[in-house]
Interface confidence: medium
């Protein structure tokens, strides 16, 4: 077959080809941020000619045009300025209310480079209705102005714009509106990953639950599905493998799904994962009926084995068949478990559809969704048992209407998204599962998203301010206990003057707590070996502080997981009979273990903990420290096996004020404290008043930098003695 001509450049932009210049290949244009390509794509026909979808002429010159945001169509009970037909990127629109009305939402909104407005819908409300005024999102027209119980409003878009969200919303019992807020978008607009991750994550992490079922908190974040720890989730991952998805993009679909699977198995709920790839026909790679669907390794390996070539004979996009195979799976499981049983009725179901475009065969996918809703008996009371996420990738040829129709509609949440490319998808999946918003004491959860604050990334991190001393750091290990270093408290015992500063979402300065009780290891005595020529000795450098009140768990305050506890065992997804030794073998499992500590300025810094023979060579440079240890004969007199060692090569060194802070590792997207910062041979902050300024040691420094951290695996008896009724310890 003839190939298509190569004179298809776009001025100011670039293009990619799904299958080279051969017939069937999709040419996709892209432009720099703030511009969009017109046309968006072309298809190489078997005749060897390029076809532009929806165009009358076959080959108009491709150009990059400036993105614009839609204008408000109307605004009730107030005025907006300036009044333009559409707005350029960076342009603002401001809203003001008439007397007697209060503005809710954003008073000023800016047009973003993706053609979407930042902020929230501005609404002028006088609070007269049973439900609050649902507002008129920019670009939409609202019909209906009564907000009594059971009243409905409907939304419409101007010509050329596509509605996403709910066209019709009804005022419900309790004052909330059904469905999700609509918006009208230009066909070229798409979502930024940094918006999708939290929106998707808010919805999803609530469904993943680990939330405390007895807590009824009403938060603007949206509902929290109360899956108890014993609850069960069926996750169905549907991966588009049709011809317009290039092999490379399919790999990223797979990788993103793997990220999702990996992360979802780090939650303390029972989950079964189904994997379905589809083009003209679906192919079930893993069914929730298979016991392996509960095993992360099996699920990941079935994903890895998903082959792009599985669908080379049928290249269409049959989304209906893919969703129908989910329906059939549900039907089989229902028959197996029994329709009336709690075992069936208590399963939550989440479907994630990753597609690059519109279904073009097999009938309307909406029909399959209706069947699924019916079999799961989804009604207002059981709305939380099904979530369908429709994610379109490759912003330019995705059918907004179809995605919108498929995605669930829940108040304060979004389930339908369009991303610019597979790279953006990967970013979203990396950051979406953020359980840091959960309110119970689940341990070792830090917000890993790119825009999280330092405290959100390490919410266990606290600052300790003893009287007239340099501050120290510490780590929350429960909602009332802090683990830190004993040497922070060697002057005086009056802890009534000490303060512990804990992260707080309401204040960038945190919240101060008084100390009810300080437990300082009796074995700690910095001068214990002075007569041996060891001027300072840091054995047993460990302390516990009990705070005067419990800390309210939040995005900014949450305990880290302590190894050798049941809590850590759950987070590591280890079997029930695991021991402390098992944890040590899993966490400190190689000669050089990457770990972190938190700097004075709150950022997370990297170190490598040296184990085995590397520990010996790491520690032995202490013998060159003639000031602190003038006549040291045996390094082990100073560096006992209570210490972990770091500070070689590119490691950061902790500063003096960072003592007591956690030395922690990341496993399965959860964080585990294996040590606490104790002492070292080099202070990178010496002579600098700037918290952000650390100087690495000169490469010629003698002795070279080394840092020593109390190894929590060696302090088990003491930890158990004082925390036995706070944490659930595993056998040694």
């Amino acid at each position: 077959a003839p190939s298509c001509p190569q004179n298809v450049n776009i001025s100011g932009g670039t293009f990619t080809l799904s299958h080279g210049w051969a017939p069937g290949s999709l040419l996709t244009y892209s432009c720099p941020q703030g511009l969009y390509p017109s046309p968006a794509s072309r298809l190489c026909k078997s005749s060897g000619q390029w076809q532009t979808p929806g165009a009358t002429r076959s080959l108009s010159k491709a150009v990059c045009k400036p993105v614009r945001c839609p204008a408000p169509v109307s605004f009730e009970n107030g005025i907006y300025t300036p009044r333009l037909g559409s707005y350029p990127v960076g342009g603002n629109v401001s809203f003001e209310c008439e007397d007697g009305f209060i503005l809710r939402g954003s008073p000023v909104r800016q047009c973003r480079p993706n053609g979407m407005w930042d902020g929230e819908t501005a609404v002028c409300d006088n609070g007269a209705g049973y439900c609050s005024n649902p507002g008129i999102p920019i670009g939409t027209r609202k019909v209906g102005s009564q907000y009594r119980l059971e009243d409905s409003v409907t939304y419409h878009c101007s010509r050329g714009l596509t509605l996403r969200g709910s066209q019709r919303r009804t005022c419900q019992e309790g004052g909330s509106w059904s469905g999700t807020e609509p918006s009208c978008q230009d066909p070229y607009s798409y979502d930024f990953p940094e918006d999708v991750a939290p929106a998707l994550g808010t919805s999803f992490s609530h469904m993943l639950g680990a939330t405390n079922p007895t807590q009824k908190t009403k938060e603007s974040l949206g509902r929290k599905i109360q899956i108890q720890r014993s609850g069960h989730l069926n996750l169905y991952l549907l991966l588009d493998c049709s011809q317009s998805v290039s092999e490379n993009d399919f790999l990223i679909f797979k990788e993103s799904a793997s990220l999702m699977v990996d992360r979802i198995f780090s939650f303390e709920i029972n989950v079964s994962v189904a994997i379905i790839t589809f083009a003209s026909e679906p192919k079930v790679l893993m069914s929730v009926l298979n016991d392996n669907s509960r095993d992360m390794t099996e699920v990941i390996s079935s994903l890895e084995n998903a082959n792009y070539k599985d669908h080379e004979n049928g290249t269409g996009t049959n989304t209906y068949a893919a969703l129908n195979s989910v329906y059939l799976m549900m039907n089989n499981q229902m028959r197996l478990l029994g329709m009336e049983t709690m075992a069936w009725q208590e399963i939550r179901h989440a479907i994630i559809l990753l597609t690059d475009g519109k279904s073009n065969m097999g009938g309307s996918p909406k029909t399959a969704v209706d069947h699924i809703r019916e079999i799961l008996n989804i009604n207002q009371k059981r709305n939380d048992y099904l979530d369908i996420y429709a994610i379109g990738v490759g912003k330019l040829d995705v059918d907004w209407r179809e995605l919108n129709e498929l995605g669930s509609k829940k108040d304060g949440e979004r389930h339908a998204f369009i991303l610019q490319d597979t790279k953006a998808l990967h970013q979203v999946f990396e950051h979406m599962l953020d359980v840091s918003k959960l309110t119970d004491t689940i341990c070792g959860v830090g917000n890993m998203s790119a825009n999280a604050s330092d405290q959100e990334r390490t919410p266990w991190h606290v600052t300790i301010k003893p009287k007239s001393q340099e501050t120290c750091r510490g780590a929350l290990i429960s909602d009332q206990w802090v683990l830190t270093a004993a040497h922070c408290f060697r002057d005086g015992n009056d802890h009534s003057l000490w303060r512990v500063n804990v992260g707080d979402p309401k204040s960038q300065w945190g919240k101060e707590f008084l100390i009810e009780k300080a437990v300082i290891s009796p074995g700690f005595d910095v001068f214990a070996k002075k007569n041996q020529g060891i001027l300072e000795f840091y054995g047993d450098d460990i302390a516990l502080l009990k705070l005067a009140q419990k800390v309210k768990m939040s995005t900014h305050a949450r305990p880290i997981c302590l190894p050798c506890t049941m809590e850590a065992n759950l987070a590591l997804r280890r079997p029930q009979g695991s021991t402390c030794r098992d944890h040590e073998n899993e966490l400190l499992n190689k000669q050089s273990v990457p770990a972190h500590f938190v700097a004075l300025n709150g950022s997370k810094l990297n170190i490598n903990l040296k184990m085995g023979v590397e520990w010996t060579s790491c520690a032995e440079v202490v013998s060159q420290e003639k000031t602190m240890f003038p006549n040291l004969t045996d390094v082990r007199e100073v560096v006992t096996d209570q210490f972990l060692c770091s500070g070689t090569q590119e490691d950061e060194s902790p500063c003096k004020g960072e003592s007591g802070g956690a030395v922690f590792l990341e496993r399965r997207f959860r964080f585990f404290q294996v040590g606490l910062v104790s002492w070292g041979l080099y202070n990178p902050c010496l002579g600098s008043a700037d918290k952000n300024s650390r100087k690495r040691a000169p490469r010629s420094k003698v002795p070279p930098p080394r840092d020593f951290h109390i190894n929590l695996f060696r302090m088990q008896p003491w930890l158990r003695q004082h925390l036995g009724d706070v944490l659930n310890f595993l056998p040694l």
């Epitope: 590119e650 300024s693 100087k695 690495r696 000169p698 490469r699 010629s700 003698v702």
Partner: antibody, heavy 118, light 111 residues
Framework: EVQLVQSGAEVKKPGASVKVSCKAS????????MDWVRQATGQGLEWIGD????????GYNQKFKGRATMTVNKSISTAYMELSSLRSEDTAVYYC???????????WGQGTLVTVSS | DNVLTQSPDSLAVSLGERATISCRAS??????????MHWYQQKPGQPPKLLIY???NLKSGVPDRFSGSGSGTDFTLTISSLQAEDAATYYC?????????FGQGTKLEIK
């Protein structure tokens, strides 16, 4: 006052070796790394490698690995750089330079001209 | 290796005028909160002389008309008011990791 005094100019035949010395004074020799840098006539500066006089550990530019050898004699506070298998393109001024606390070259020797010619 | 590219290769500036030399690194030279980029001045027949260390710190004894700025990969050496004795070749050099490398040099002449 910190001083680095290098040995005199050398003329060598291709294939031969040359050993340049650098005597340090005015500071504790083992406290700072010594680096070697060369500069061909009218050309830029090229880093050869460095040595930590305390541990006698070295770091080399891959380009010179196997041909350059850096050593020290702590007792006389002197650093040495030997370059073997000389070629005409090795004709250059060779400098020793002492690193400071910021790993910058704060002090330099006067330079030693090595000429490789048949 | 981290390649340092200086621009321009040469420039001529009048006495009392400002001279600016740029240095771009192929990889970031920032670590531990500092930029490990240094600037040297070399006059014919002499070894180089350190002017600026860690991107922006003036070595003691160096006139304060010399200043350095930049972070990550882009750095600038500025001479605020050119004096006759500033005619020389200027080099940037990084010490972020081994191997250390130098820029190709910028020759500064008096107009």
């Amino acid at each position: 006052e910190v001083q680095l005094v290098q040995s005199g100019a050398e003329v060598k035949k291709p294939g031969a070796s040359v050993k340049v010395s650098c005597k340090a004074s005015g500071y504790t020799f083992t406290d700072y790394n010594m680096d070697w840098v060369r500069q061909a006539t009218g050309q830029g500066l090229e880093w050869i490698g460095d040595i930590n006089p305390n541990y006698e550990s070295t770091g080399y530019n891959q380009k010179f690995k196997g041909r350059a050898t850096m050593t020290v004699n702590k007792s006389i506070s002197t650093a040495y750089m030997e370059l073997s298998s000389l070629r005409s393109e090795d004709t250059a001024v060779y400098y020793c330079a002492r690193e400071d606390d910021h790993d910058a070259f704060a002090y330099w020797g006067q330079g030693t001209l090595v000429t490789v010619s048949s | 290796d981290n390649v340092l590219t200086q621009s321009p290769d040469s420039l001529a500036v009048s006495l009392g005028e400002r001279a600016t030399i740029s240095c771009r690194a192929s990889k970031s030279v920032r670590t531990s909160g500092y930029n490990y980029m240094h600037w040297y001045q070399q006059k014919p027949g002499q070894p180089p002389k350190l002017l600026i260390y860690l991107a922006s710190n003036l070595k003691s004894g160096v006139p304060d008309r010399f200043s350095g700025s930049g972070s990550g990969t882009d750095f600038t050496l500025t001479i605020s008011s050119l004096q006759a004795e500033d005619a020389a070749t200027y080099y940037c050099q990084h010490s972020r990791e081994l191997p250390y490398t130098f820029g190709q040099g910028t020759k500064l002449e008096i107009k």
